[in-house]
Amino acid sequence: EEELQVIQPDKSVLVAAGETATLRCTATSLIPVGPIQWFRGAGPGRELIYNQKEGHFPRVTTVSDLTKRNNMDFSIRIGNITPADAGTYYCVKFRKGSPDDVEFKSGAGTELSVRAKPSAPVVSGPAARATPQHTVSFTCESHGFSPRDITLKWFKNGNELSDFQTNVDPVGESVSYSIHSTAKVVLTREDVHSQVICEVAHVTLQGDPLRGTANLSETIRVPPTLEVTQQPVRAENQVNVTCQVRKFYPQRLQLTWLENGNVSRTETASTVTENKDGTYNWMSWLLVNVSAHRDDVKLTCQVEHDGQPAVSKSHDLKVSAHPKEQGSNTAAENTGSNERNIY
């Protein structure tokens, strides 16, 4: 009778993560009597995957009933495959021995490759906000995919970006891989509504790439422009001074009125109007009584935006002037108006 051979017909098996792998093995003879064991890897450090004789292997089932006397099919199924299961699996026939069974013959091995999907890309921007014309960096990370080949693209509002660097780790063989990419984006004043998108394509995704997004609204700071104007209102001795705060983002803004350098009033932007580009406008005003003034008054609108150093705009109020013919009195009727008498 010919000596027993252990046949593993599949050189390699490719399985998607989460699925079941079938590893085939047959023996050409029933003798010598003895059990079959499955190992991952070879040599002294090999890992026992299944032992016909004893042990608990909850993820492993046998294809046929190994307790049957004439069974020569030692194929197994491994459930819920993960990238960590990748490797070469050997079906090994033992002969009965004492005190331990003795390895008799091994199959040639079956390489199990695991296809694992990348995790959803996570895009993160800079820790601090930046202003238009500045270049900021965005990072994109995705993990746990296999095989190593992967494609990553960056987009800003649908337009592909070219200024980015990507690394896939580790460089050598591994059960699964991670990708890390950094893209540089130049901010513009119109970017409040913009999005940066990281798109990852992998063989496991069947042409339906994964995307991670970052809203530039989290990154950009558009500093306001200020304009201070005066208008006459109702009585000849009252002047309405307005401070127009335009095109700012984010909304966090504090305005202080100074009269000849002294703090007159501080308020926080609340009832703002939003522009189409996502920036905000806000207006604050003072009703100034000039009748008691002998000298000119210097009014300053000082704005602290998003914790940045204050910017200001001043307006000189001439007390000798009679501005009754300028503008209209509509601002005085605004419910947000604030009267301020100067003595």
Partner: antibody, heavy 120, light 107 residues
Framework: QVQLVQSGAEVKKPGASVKVSCKAS????????IVWVRQAPGQGLEWMGW????????NYAQKLQGRVTMTTDTSTSTAYMELRSLRSDDTAVYYC?????????????WGRGTLVTVSS | DIQMTQSPSSVSASVGDRVTITCRAS??????LAWYQQKPGKAPKLLIY???NLQSGVPSRFSGSGSGTDFTLTISSLQPEDFATYYC?????????FGGGTKVEIK
Amino acid sequence: QVQLVQSGAEVKKPGASVKVSCKASGYTFTGYGIVWVRQAPGQGLEWMGWISAYAGETNYAQKLQGRVTMTTDTSTSTAYMELRSLRSDDTAVYYCAREAGSSWYDFDLWGRGTLVTVSS
Amino acid sequence: DIQMTQSPSSVSASVGDRVTITCRASQGISSWLAWYQQKPGKAPKLLIYAASNLQSGVPSRFSGSGSGTDFTLTISSLQPEDFATYYCQQGASFPITFGGGTKVEIK
């Protein structure tokens, strides 16, 4: 025909030795183990030991250790069991059997038995 | 050593009866249990291996079940030729041990 043929009955005096043979035919001798089991008159079955016909490795029952030796001759497909320093309580029918389980031990083919009587 | 305890030690039954013999191992032996039939002056004969597998040529009225420590041999309809002594045997590890036997006698 698959069978195990044992040697004939023996009468021995206490302190003597006995060697029982078991000749296999009809199958590949080296593919299976051989066990020896004895049965004293009116008693149950007692496992004595096991030998690999492939490599000659052995495993003996603790109580017989030092008195029993099991061997094989692959050229004649024969297994032997020698028991030394015989005592009267060694009087029994001695069976050889083929051990056929893959990852366990069970015995699917038995010899007819050899009666060994130890008497002064 | 693994002790094998068989019960009952004897049972009286009639032809056609259903007979159940139990065997308990002192520790878990998975499914590595065999059952043998022995008639007077004859060698034991393997009936069941690996707890529940019927040995080739054995009538289907014999069946085995159990795993771990508790096992059962059932003869579904006793026949005249079934009057004999039955032994269980653990085959999980050395030393191999047998139960004390159950004698099935004619009522």
